[in-house]
């Protein structure tokens, strides 16, 4: 067992080293370990093949680090791991896109509060048991086609806290199992009108905080699941265009929030919800 | 690191408006929600309401007429008005940061007593 | 307004297992937080998103949400954790946050 961590049996082989320090991957991590903890400590590099010898690992957390940089090797061999937490290492800003691949039994992955600027493409390829993906409070701008496209049975996926500008037709393709998107505290000022196309089993969808002042209904009439919307705090604009939406938000069966109108200046802040047919009036 | 630091009075006499600032320090009141909670005692937290990008404000309904919650991007921080008090209102009122949906951080709490 | 169903108290010995549970119909389909509140001090979110750990927070924290309930679990409770505990969704009937009664852990 590594100096700085304690090794035990029960319930699962776990080499724990929180919160001491470490500027480095351990040397001499038990090959039996199941779990590996890591966080909290000063780690900046995880290096190709670091894990390669722990055949049997199925929980690493390697968050509240300062991971600047996770060679696309570091994760080689570890055919059984099912949670991977890097979340808190606000220094990564980007992973190679290979990074991931081979995780076929991954189920969670946490990439929340890396920094991260952009997905590289086929950075999620070949995920097929992921059900959570954190990726929060990132700066993410664009959500680039098909990036989600093997992920058929992620339930949860968190993109709020970026700075998200449009949702394209192509963003979610391939989410069939989709239970809650979260969307909300980005810049999104467009979604494309087959954007959650894929999402026929999508309960919650949260886009409050971001920068639409229109939404199209044909968005929405794929979301047969849909439960619990919310869209406040949008720049909602509520003349004849906000028809659709108005007429949609009648008939939706699930709860939504208020969808506070901004224009025109007469039904500032009335909700959309509650207004008659005719006040969405001129365009 | 996110901390809030609460300020104001412990003591406020019935009838009178409780008011309590929140200052907040690594992070821009720019950003998130920011509300306030308060937890009579013996009972339950209970949410008073939330500012947004400085001027969006929303307000449990159940206090929706006596609240006010305001903001000072130049100082960094929010405020609460409750006004019209009574003993009912005697609680620890705490400010938090709200993700939107979660309270990630949290003021140290404010105890406030209504009596004359 | 509502309230999210928590037990008044759950007693557990050093070294076992407590669970906190929170009701409501279909709370499963809603995301559940949770947060502690050691005496004196002010809350501190522990689990969000049903199932997610804060940083920080011992692994022996765990979370899960479905059908019915939200449950809060602590594996080989130790003293320290002696805290009230709340659970805490987004009520979409109010159109804001509520929270449950809370749970006050004794450790034994």
């Known amino acids: 067992c590594p100096g700085a961590c304690v090794c035990y049996n029960e319930p699962k082989v776990t080499t724990s080293c929180p919160q001491q320090g470490l500027q480095a991957v351990p040397v001499g991590i038990p090959a039996a370990s199941q779990r590996i903890f890591l966080h909290g400590n000063r780690i900046s590099h995880v290096p190709a093949a670091s894990f390669r010898a722990c055949r049997n690992l199925t929980i690493l957390w390697l968050h509240s680090n300062v991971l600047a940089r996770i060679d696309a090797a570091a994760f080689t061999g570890l055919a059984l791991l099912e949670q991977l937490d890097l979340s808190d290492n606000a220094q990564l800003r980007s992973v190679d896109p290979a990074t991931f691949h081979g995780l076929g039994r991954l189920h969670t992955l946490h990439l929340d509060r890396c920094g991260l600027q952009e997905l590289g493409p086929g950075l999620f390829r070949g995920l097929a048991a992921l059900q959570y993906l954190y990726l929060q409070d990132n700066a993410l701008q664009a959500l680039p086609d098909d990036t989600f496209r093997d992920l058929g049975n992620l339930t949860h996926l968190f993109l709020h806290g970026n700075r998200i500008s449009s949702v394209p037709e192509r963003a979610f393709r391939g989410l069939h199992s989709l239970d809650r998107l979260l969307l909300h505290q980005n810049r999104v000022a467009h979604v494309h009108p087959h954007a959650f196309r894929d999402l026929g089993r999508l309960m919650t969808l949260y886009l409050f905080a971001n920068n639409l002042s229109a939404l199209p209904t044909e968005a929405l009439a794929p979301l047969r699941a849909l439960q619990y919307l919310r869209l406040n705090d949008n720049p909602w604009v509520c003349d004849c265009r906000a028809r659709p939406l108005w007429a949609w938000l009648q008939k939706f069966r699930g709860s939504s929030s208020e969808v506070p109108c901004s224009l025109p200046q007469r039904l500032a802040g009335r909700d959309l919800k509650r207004l008659a047919a005719n006040d969405l009036q001129g365009c | 690191q996110v901390q809030l630091q609460q300020s104001g009075p412990g003591l406020v006499k019935p009838s009178e408006t409780l008011s309590l600032t929140c200052t907040v320090s690594?992070?821009?009141?720019?950003?998130?929600?920011w509300s306030w909670v308060r937890q009579p005692p013996g009972k339950t937290l209970e949410w008073i309401g939330y500012?947004?990008?400085?001027?969006?404000?929303k307000y449990n309904p159940s206090l929706k007429s006596r609240v006010t919650i305001s903001a000072d991007t130049s100082k960094n921080q929010f405020s609460l008005k409750l006004s019209s008090v009574t003993a009912a209102d005697t609680a620890v009122y705490y400010c938090?940061?709200?993700?939107?949906?979660?309270?990630?951080?949290w003021g140290q709490g404010t105890m406030v007593t209504v009596s004359s | 307004q509502s309230v999210l169903t928590q037990p008044p108290s759950v007693s557990v010995a050093a070294g076992q297992t407590a669970r906190i549970t929170c009701g409501e119909a279909?709370?499963?389909?809603?995301?559940v937080h949770w947060y502690q509140r050691r005496p004196g001090q002010a809350p501190l979110m522990v689990i969000y998103?049903?199932?997610a750990r804060r940083s920080g927070i011992p692994e022996r924290f765990s979370g899960s949400n479905s059908g019915d309930t939200a449950t809060l679990t602590i594996s080989r409770v130790e003293a320290g954790d002696e805290a009230d505990y709340y659970c805490?969704?987004?009520?979409?009937?109010?159109?804001?946050?509520?929270f449950g009664g809370g749970t006050k852990v004794t450790v034994l």
């Open positions: 938090a940061r709200d993700a939107g949906t979660i309270f990630d951080y």
């Open positions: 690594g992070d821009s009141i720019t950003s998130y929600y």
């Open positions: 500012i947004f990008d400085t001027r969006t404000t």
């Open positions: 279909n709370i499963g389909r809603r995301s």
């Open positions: 998103y049903d199932t």
């Open positions: 805490q969704a987004w009520d979409f009937s109010s159109d804001h946050p509520v």
